[in-house]
Amino acid sequence: SAPGEDEECGRVRDFVAKLANNTHQHVFDDLRGSVSLSWVGDSTGVILVLTTFHVPLVIMTFGQSKLYRSEDYGKNFKDITDLINNTFIRTEFGMAIGPENSGKVVLTAEVSGGSRGGRIFRSSDFAKNFVQTDLPFHPLTQMMYSPQNSDYLLALSTENGLWVSKNFGGKWEEIHKAVCLAKWGSDNTIFFTTYANGSCKADLGALELWRTSDLGKSFKTIGVKIYSFGLGGRFLFASVMADKDTTRRIHVSTDQGDTWSMAQLPSVGQEQFYSILAANDDMVFMHVDEPGDTGFGTIFTSDDRGIVYSKSLDRHLYTTTGGETDFTNVTSLRGVYITSVLSEDNSIQTMITFDQGGRWTHLRKPENSECDATAKNKNECSLHIHASYSISQKLNVPMAPLSEPNAVGIVIAHGSVGDAISVMVPDVYISDDGGYSWTKMLEGPHYYTILDSGGIIVAIEHSSRPINVIKFSTDEGQCWQTYTFTRDPIYFTGLASEPGARSMNISIWGFTESFLTSQWVSYTIDFKDILERNCEEKDYTIWLAHSTDPEDYEDGCILGYKEQFLRLRKSSVCQNGRDYVVTKQPSICLCSLEDFLCDFGYYRPENDSKCVEQPELKGHDLEFCLYGREEHLTTNGYRKIPGDKCQGGVNPVREVKDLKKKCTSNFLSPEKQNSKSN
């Protein structure tokens, strides 16, 4: 039988009446155009909705926008367009919401052609009030908040000026001209690239990388011949043009650009690219594009300095610069990532790693599924996950994979079961153990979301026809109940729930269409009465993450430690609650060779845990350039994997000696750096 139709599925008692009492409809007095929704703050219940409507006239476009505010998680909305003087808001800039719970909001207005500068509306009280501010420039990008201080904003102008405000957009100062890209770093530092001659495009590869740590009072040039730069975790990366030709290489800094080292990564040509797929304070996943228009490249994982890289995955699907990759961090379980590879026969297959890129495998076939037509052997196949690439190819995939840090182990995704991704209509699959095992959860494509830290999963069928039914599960997708939330079906456009998956409210957005008009409508359903009691200690059970063999006393050991979690029992129908904190207990594991990556000058042959010397370096002293000094490495080929916490067991020897010699194996040596003040 289909999932959710088994006899043992206990029904949630009287749920129709409970949900009917907690279903709130709001019809927006708008012609249908576009709608964007933003949550302001965490656990505040404040939602801003901006509707915009464009009418193309002969010589110009007439636009109208409306702003609505809810402070009860979307149950009721108030039209607050008058707070922004009925001004038309530019949707391409979105609503710039301040970090954390600052309550700050910036809206960028559309201004008439001849004006001296742009206009913004600012709120610092969760959009209760707005202040209109005229800008001394026309913004090119959305206002960017400093992660450390929400009063500090930066923006680029249409004339490539870098503008900074220290009082939440009240006053602005241009701190530099000819700026291509600017980013906030840590401690209110700003990194930006500048061009000297023509433009950002013309000077690509000849840009300079600058840093200011005092909001523009003084500057330091920290790199030259820059193509681009990026920040990931505690690493600052720059791709730098080689002196001789048109190739470029990645350089990395862990001290905000004061010193640089050349990353042990292949150089790339003009048509290729580097991409930081994921980064944390321990390490980085780097994609290096293959030469030619192949649509794939190689994933490398770094050591703790971002310098030495191990090849992690070949033929990694990544279409073009800024194109599509399926690389997904499974946030519900440490060390897990999912992505796609392009096979020799041009089919696309899903791969998963449970140890932060150390090993990749296919996804295990769900037990309740048959292999499809792509499978050569009908008994042996894998699950393949649809992600960004499938969505970009307009397959019938309404949503990317979903996981939440506080819904431990849960991963929901569209997929097909065979030898490769299928273009047939996908089904929805769920894993409750971070991707080790999978079950078909729903037949056909659906929108889905996680509520109450995994206590409830909500889904809506993806259909071209109007809908009025929502499905929900209180047991991690095993059994499903359906609820008709309105008599009059709506054209569904999206599910919205508060980021963080702690809420018990879900908003269903759509529009109604009648003979002459169409209107936006939202239905907000509160599930609090379905989960009528708070969870108690007895509702939780101990679960060991990454468990693959319970008889092994190293079971669950990943990156040197294992973690036991307290997880809600599937049979418990209760509220985790908004204050729920994941309870986990780590225990250190003994070290094995699996806890080490191969050091500079060493590699791991396939299916071997031992590191062997690269033939071309055999018998040579291992000397390499680090922070502009020559280092001598004494190693037996191993370096602890970043973030690995193992103790005891195997312990390879490793020693690095500073040879006290200068070297310039990189183009960002300190001599080429300079400082200046405004």
Partner: antibody, heavy 120, light 107 residues
Framework: EVQLVESGGGLVKPGGSLRLSCAAS????????MNWVRQAPGKGLEWVSS????????YYADSVKGRFTISRDNAKNSLYLQMNSLRAEDTAVYYC?????????????WGQGTMVTVSS | EIVLTQSPDFQSVTPKEKVTITCRAS??????LHWYQQKPDQSPKLLIK???QSFSGVPSRFSGSGSGTDFTLTINSLEAEDAAAYYC?????????FGGGTKVEIK
């Protein structure tokens, strides 16, 4: 009824050998990891050795490593401990214990124990 | 090796009284701690597994709590038949180890 019965204990001289057996009944023996735990007279419990259901994983305490060998015969529902080079400090009651089926599980079923005395 | 330190070593208690035995691990063992009861001339019996889960058939007066490094076994209302030695045991890391034991005597 779930039961473990040890046998093979007795008096042995230092340097001698002994083979302990444990007969299991009332459960699917081949599905569980099994262990030997000992208790010296008037002292506490000390883990000796562990063997997984299919003998893939075998573990020993440092104090017996190289001298004791754990084995099992799933067809006969039996667990064994071959003890060589016995020392006076090996004198104890030896218990056979079943480990639960979960990861890092407890010893949920114990035998009644068999006494091993090493003395000249 | 993970050392389990049990306290007290000995406790003399009157019936109906509450008994608390603690077990401290030398490093974090998560929830992989179990409690056993051993009556004189008998083999040990499992009371509590994974720090707080009561084993089937164990009277409800026995409860366990804790995680990481600090664990507690509580006997809520002591009965005469509870006179025994109580041992904690960690299964988190090899070698598997036991606490030194706590002997509970009825006054």
């Amino acid at each position: 009824e779930v039961q473990l019965v040890e046998s093979g204990g007795g008096l042995v001289k230092p340097g001698g050998s002994l083979r302990l057996s444990c007969a299991a009944s009332g459960f699917t023996f081949s599905s569980y990891s099994m262990n030997w735990v000992r208790q010296a007279p008037g002292k506490g419990l000390e883990w000796v050795s562990s063997i997984s259901s299919s003998s893939s994983y075998i573990y020993y305490a440092d104090s017996v490593k190289g001298r004791f060998t754990i084995s099992r015969d799933n067809a006969k529902n039996s667990l064994y401990l071959q003890m060589n080079s016995l020392r006076a400090e090996d004198t104890a009651v030896y218990y056979c214990a079943r480990r639960g089926s979960g990861s890092y599980d407890a010893f949920d079923i114990w035998g009644q124990g068999t006494m091993v005395t090493v003395s000249s | 090796e993970i050392v389990l330190t049990q306290s007290p070593d000995f406790q003399s208690v009157t019936p109906k009284e509450k008994v608390t035995i603690t077990c401290r691990a030398s490093q974090s063992i998560g929830y992989s701690l179990h409690w056993y009861q051993q009556k004189p001339d008998q083999s040990p019996k499992l009371l509590i597994k994974y720090a707080s889960q009561s084993f089937s058939g164990v009277p409800s007066r026995f409860s366990g709590s804790g995680s990481g490094t600090d664990f507690t076994l509580t006997i809520n209302s002591l009965e005469a038949e509870d006179a025994a030695a109580y041992y904690c045991h960690q299964s988190s890391s090899l070698p598997l180890t036991f606490g030194g034991g706590t002997k509970v005597e009825i006054k």
